[in-house]
């Protein structure tokens, strides 16, 4: 029997200070560039080596960015989202959704490290 793939979704507030070369990441998504089917959200597609985001260490490729400095990123065109980041100032607060893939074992099988029993 195959295991089931589940996702653990968590949210985090990440405060970044813009470095000499900026925030240090790339994004995909937007109403005109759907990266995930049926989701026009903004996702992190690249973390630049030695950039502000990489040095902070919390933002990851695949994270969904929900808001920037309290401004919701829903229903934005891709370029409008890019411009929002570029104009966000020196101290940038990101509300981020991490989606961690969790592989469950076959039904009836107690996985290693299962606390019950």
């Amino acid at each position: 029997m195959n295991g089931r793939v589940d996702y653990l979704v968590t949210e985090e507030e990440i405060n970044l200070t813009r470095g000499p070369s900026g925030l240090g990441f790339n994004i995909v998504g937007g109403t005109d560039q759907q990266y995930v089917s049926n989701d026009s959200g903004i996702y992190v597609s690249r973390i630049k080596e030695n950039g502000a985001a990489a040095l902070d260490g919390r933002l990851q490729e695949g994270d969904k960015i929900l808001s920037v400095n309290g401004q919701d990123l829903k229903n934005l065109l891709h370029q409008d989202a890019v411009d929002l980041f570029r104009n966000a100032g020196y101290a940038v607060s990101l509300r981020v959704q991490h989606r961690l893939q969790v592989q469950n074992g076959p039904i009836g099988h107690r996985g290693e490290g299962d606390p019950s029993g």
Epitope: G22, N26, I27, V28, R46, G51, H78, Q79
Partner: nanobody, 126 residues
Framework: DVQLVESGGGSVQAGGSLRLSCTAS????????MAWFRQAPGKEREFVAA??????YYADSVKGRFTISRDNAKNTMYLQMNSLKPEDTAVYIC?????????????????????WGQGTQVTVSS
């Protein structure tokens, strides 16, 4: 990982034309920021042109002669090269990165890109 394969190079007389293609793997090609660089023997790698979600960029040396474009349905980027000159002789290399930088974009900076092709040779004789 993204694989990039260039084609369309060859030998041509000065004043002639060539169209280079760069075909990429990956289901999200439309999100890629892409560029052409070139490298002549004994010289530094040089930026030629780039295409992003919002526009196109060209080196001054090719402006008005070269045109960068893409066909998202074919996962392919093109470089139409007209009025070729002997100084355009080089290996032409395709580069890509997924997404758009949230910082100011420097199309000529190789660090903007994560993926590189092997290149295709263009030779222009006088």
């Amino acid at each position: 990982d993204v694989q990039l394969v260039e084609s369309g190079g060859g030998s041509v007389q000065a004043g002639g034309s060539l169209r280079l293609s760069c075909t990429a793997s990956g289901r999200t090609f439309s999100t890629y920021t892409m560029a052409w660089f070139r490298q002549a023997p004994g010289k530094e790698r040089e930026f030629v042109a780039a295409i992003t979600w919002s526009g196109t960029y060209y080196a001054d040396s090719v402006k008005g002669r070269f045109t960068i474009s893409r066909d998202n349905a074919k996962n392919t980027m093109y470089l139409q090269m007209n009025s070729l000159k002997p100084e355009d002789t080089a290996v032409y290399i395709c580069a890509a990165v997924i997404g758009s930088t949230v910082d100011s974009y420097s199309p000529s900076d190789p660090l903007e890109y994560d993926y590189w092709g092997q290149g295709t040779q263009v030779t222009v004789s006088s």
